[in-house]
């Protein structure tokens, strides 16, 4: 069992990774926050059955403050929520208008987290002199995952404990009492 994806014990409740709910409609329609991973391009010819890698799903960007006990992150973090339906979809006849419309059929495809990153955040805490930091595990990208009848919800939950792959590059290093700088939750087998 996992660290509960670096469990957020905050007042801002964040579902465990791999268990994000469908975003509310107002988020879905917020074009400034959404981007289709395939750039909005249709996946080749609509009648072709492509590999799942040809399809993608929407990544909703949102920001939040990380909290831990009475502490709050100095800056908000940007996170993704994986949303929307995945292909392969087939153009099926629309009985009403004789037109074509997208409708998923066959195996179930889900939009789920693909990669994670761990981000260090500096916490601002009331009282207490020592700066505190924590690392939060954030969804870095989403992908379409084919779920057969044998891979139901339990498969989705596996992604919550998938090893994180944090972004490369150095982050700011605020710390306390160090010569180098100015300032400074997996399940526990009980």
């Amino acid at each position: 069992q996992g660290w509960q994806a670096f469990k957020n014990d905050a007042t801002e409740i964040i579902p465990e990774l791999g268990e994000y709910p469908e975003p509310p409609p107002e988020l879905e329609n917020n074009k400034t926050m959404n981007r289709a991973e395939n750039g909005g391009r249709p996946p080749h010819h609509p009648f072709e059955t492509k590999d799942v890698s040809e399809y993608s799903c929407r990544e909703l960007h949102f920001t939040r403050y990380v909290t831990d006990g009475p502490c709050r992150s100095a800056k908000p973090v940007t996170e993704l929520v994986c949303s929307g339906q995945c292909g392969p979809a087939r153009l099926l006849p629309n009985a009403i208008g004789r037109g074509k419309w997208w409708r998923p059929s066959g195996p179930d495809f889900r939009c789920i987290p693909d990669r994670y990153r761990a981000q260090r955040v500096q916490l601002l805490c009331p009282g207490g002199e020592a700066p505190r930091a924590r690392k939060v595990r954030l969804v870095a990208s989403c992908k379409c995952k084919r779920l057969t009848r044998f891979h139901n919800q339990s498969e989705l939950k596996d992604f919550g404990t998938e090893a994180a792959r944090p972004q490369k590059g150095r982050k700011p290093r605020p710390r306390a009492r160090s010569a180098k700088a100015n300032q400074a939750e997996l399940e526990n087998a009980y």
Partner: antibody, heavy 118, light 107 residues
């Protein structure tokens, strides 16, 4: 499951150095903070410091400043703690611990006994 | 350094008893306090953090309370596996420091 496996017991002479390793599995070490805590025979726990493997950041207890060095090899998910200028009072069990914060120790290694004796 | 004083240093109790361990800080540490359990020859395990939040998987019979300088760890109904030594740890200011421990023994 997160597991921390430490290197074996060491016997050192006063003035020598010791380097204890801690292999982390179940999570990439750079996604965590690594802590070191020691416990002298029959005594309580003593925090030595923490490090951030991703950026090489460290915070050492002032008592150990200048004698302790905490490093990591992120390619092997292994943390190291080196203590120099050993004296008899450094005889203790040394624990590595890991967590998502700089202030709590979520998971612990099994401990490494270091004996300093002439 | 902030001194953490635990009392009692040891206590004897029976299975089913309610046990209370106290931890006092030498200065105000708000609720920046953790509790750990350690069994002989084993590494400690995190029980409580932020003074009162149970760590994942810790049974509900363990509870923490307090703020400022005085804190308590309570085991509502002592179980055979609870006989161990318990440590508090402050993280209000560096260096993080532990209490001297409270050993809970079988009566």
């Amino acid at each position: 499951q997160v597991q921390l496996v430490q290197s074996g017991a060491e016997v050192k002479k006063p003035g020598a150095s010791v380097k204890v390793s801690c292999k982390v599995s179940g999570f990439p070490i750079k996604d965590t903070f690594q802590h070191w805590v020691r416990q002298a025979p029959g005594k309580g726990l003593e925090w030595m410091g923490w490090s951030d493997p991703e950026i090489g950041d460290t915070e050492y207890a002032s008592k150990f400043q200048g004698r302790v060095t905490m490093t990591e090899d992120t390619s092997t998910d292994t943390a190291y703690m080196e203590l120099s200028s050993l004296r008899s009072e450094d005889t203790a069990v040394y624990y590595c611990a890991t967590g998502d914060t700089t202030y709590k120790f979520d998971f612990w290694g099994q401990g490494t006994t270091v004996t300093v004796s002439s | 350094d902030i001194q953490m004083t635990q009392s009692p240093s040891s206590l004897s109790a029976s299975v089913g008893d309610r046990v209370t361990i106290t931890c006092r800080a030498s200065q105000d540490i708000s609720n920046y306090l953790n509790w750990y359990q350690q069994k002989p020859g084993k590494a400690p395990k995190l029980l409580i953090y932020w003074a009162s939040t149970r760590w994942t998987g810790v049974p509900s019979r363990f509870s923490g309370s307090g703020s400022g300088t005085d804190f308590t760890l309570t085991i509502s109904s002592l179980q055979p596996e609870d006989f161990a030594t318990y440590y508090c740890q402050q993280y209000s200011d560096y260096p993080w420091t532990f209490g001297g421990g409270t050993k809970v023994e079988i009566k």
